[in-house]
């Protein structure tokens, strides 16, 4: 028979024959021969391979370095890498999550639109008319101005995006 020029899915061509790739979680030790299938070995502790492969070495699991604010979100297996996330109050600087930075706080005049997670920073928004924020916070939303009317009071000082309105008693009507 003619030697193959292309192989099936999950096979590779070597020495004019198609050999099976190693399954995820295993590395290549010996190519197949005329008499035996490809020899694959399981990845060691703290190693992984996540695809059908012909790698002779497994990859090391990612190390979640606590000195960079990282912690393990999901422990790696022989088929998956470790997933790191950041300690409380911190978030990843990139998709690969190789280091962390402190969550941003929203300045006075701005409120939290979306609270930060381990992988995304705080999203702030300017407080619209009728709302204010007088603190720098990573959690506080813009608060609505106090409604003086519902308290039978009147506005003595208008609110801003950084301050609440100041309510006071209504002027008494003279007879």
């Amino acid at each position: 028979p003619e030697p193959p020029t292309a192989c099936r899915e999950k096979q590779y061509l070597i020495n004019s024959q198609c050999c099976s790739l190693c399954q995820p979680g295993q590395k290549l030790v010996s190519d197949c021969t005329e008499f035996t299938e490809t020899e694959c070995l399981p990845c060691g502790e703290s190693e992984f391979l996540d695809t059908w492969n012909r790698e002779t070495h497994c990859h090391q699991h990612k190390y979640c370095d606590p000195n960079l604010g990282l912690r393990v979100q999901q422990k790696g297996t022989s088929e998956t890498d470790t997933i790191c996330t950041c300690e409380e109050g911190w978030h990843c600087t990139s998709e690969a999550c190789e280091s962390c930075v402190l969550h941003r706080s929203c300045s006075p005049g701005f409120g939290v639109k979306q609270i930060a997670t381990g992988v995304s920073d705080t999203i702030c928004e300017p407080c619209p008319v009728g709302f204010f924020s007088n603190v720098s916070s990573a959690f506080e939303k813009c608060h609505p101005w106090t409604s003086c009317e519902t308290k039978d009071l009147v506005v003595q000082q208008a609110g801003t995006n950084k301050t609440d309105v100041v309510c006071g008693p209504q002027d008494r009507l003279r007879a």
Partner: antibody
Framework: QVKLEESGGGLVKPGGSLKLSCAAS????????MSWVRQSPGERLEWVAE????????YYPDTVTGRFTISRDNANNTLYLEVSSLRSEDTAMYYC?????WGQGTLVTVSA | DIVMTQSPTLSLPVSLGDQASISCRSS???????????LEWYLQRPGQSPKLLIY???NRFSGVPDRFSGSGSGTDFTLKISRVEAEDLGVYYC?????????FGGGTKLEIK
């Protein structure tokens, strides 16, 4: 050229042990799974053990599991078969083979 | 275990120059999921160790004359010798190396009629 040379056979009493060796040359030994095949006088061939190229995987038929141990030393191109708890029915010529090539065999005789 | 049954079971008398055919049947399929079939044919001449003739059903091993050919699939396999020569005499064995425990056929002795 390829050469496989067995040694270590001999006369042994029932229940006894032996360690067979096979010196390989002329090919990249570590790339090939290796087997031991035996043949009793006037009988068919019987496969008794295989070891993968790295030595990590070993396979045996039920008739010898727990009594025979195949191993290899890739640094010295040598294949081994440790045989223990020997029985009279283990009497045979033991061949070392890569399947493509075979040695001349070493004779194991189990007799009281 | 997979049983390999050869026929003729004991001997096959032939005249030199004739064609000879030996059949081998496995008790279950020896085709792997990736399509490989580890079916081999060996010749053991008197007083010698076995020699590989055919591997993977139909591939002639290096140095084996082209008068030897292998065919078959699934569970039925055949070794053909197109013109028998004196050096071809001996016992022929089929062997399956697809599933552990690997097994040999009982052997067929090719002899002169």
């Amino acid at each position: 050229q390829v050469k496989l040379e067995e040694s270590g056979g001999g006369l042994v009493k029932p229940g006894g042990s032996l360690k067979l060796s096979c010196a390989a040359s002329g090919f990249t030994f570590r790339n090939y799974a290796m087997s031991w095949v035996r043949q009793s006088p006037g009988e068919r061939l019987e496969w008794v053990a295989e070891v993968s190229g790295s030595g990590y995987y070993t396979y045996y038929p039920d008739t010898v599991t727990g009594r025979f141990t195949i191993s290899r030393d890739n640094a010295n191109n040598t294949l081994y078969l440790e045989v223990s708890s020997l029985r009279s029915e283990d009497t045979a010529m033991y061949y070392c083979t890569s399947r493509a090539y075979w040695g001349q065999g070493t004779l194991v005789t189990v007799s009281a | 275990d997979i049983v390999m049954t050869q026929s003729p079971t004991l001997s096959l008398p032939v005249s030199l120059g004739d064609q000879a055919s030996i059949s081998c049947r496995s008790s279950q399929s020896i085709v792997l999921t990736n399509g490989n079939t580890y079916l081999e044919w060996y010749l053991q001449r008197p007083g010698q160790s076995p020699k590989l003739l055919i591997y993977k059903v139909s591939n002639r091993f290096s140095g084996v004359p082209d008068r030897f050919s292998g065919s078959g699939s699934g569970t039925d396999f055949t070794l053909k010798i197109s013109r028998v020569e004196a050096e071809d005499l001996g016992v022929y064995y089929c062997f399956q190396g697809s599933h552990v425990p690997y097994t040999f056929g009982g052997g067929t002795k090719l002899e002169i009629k």
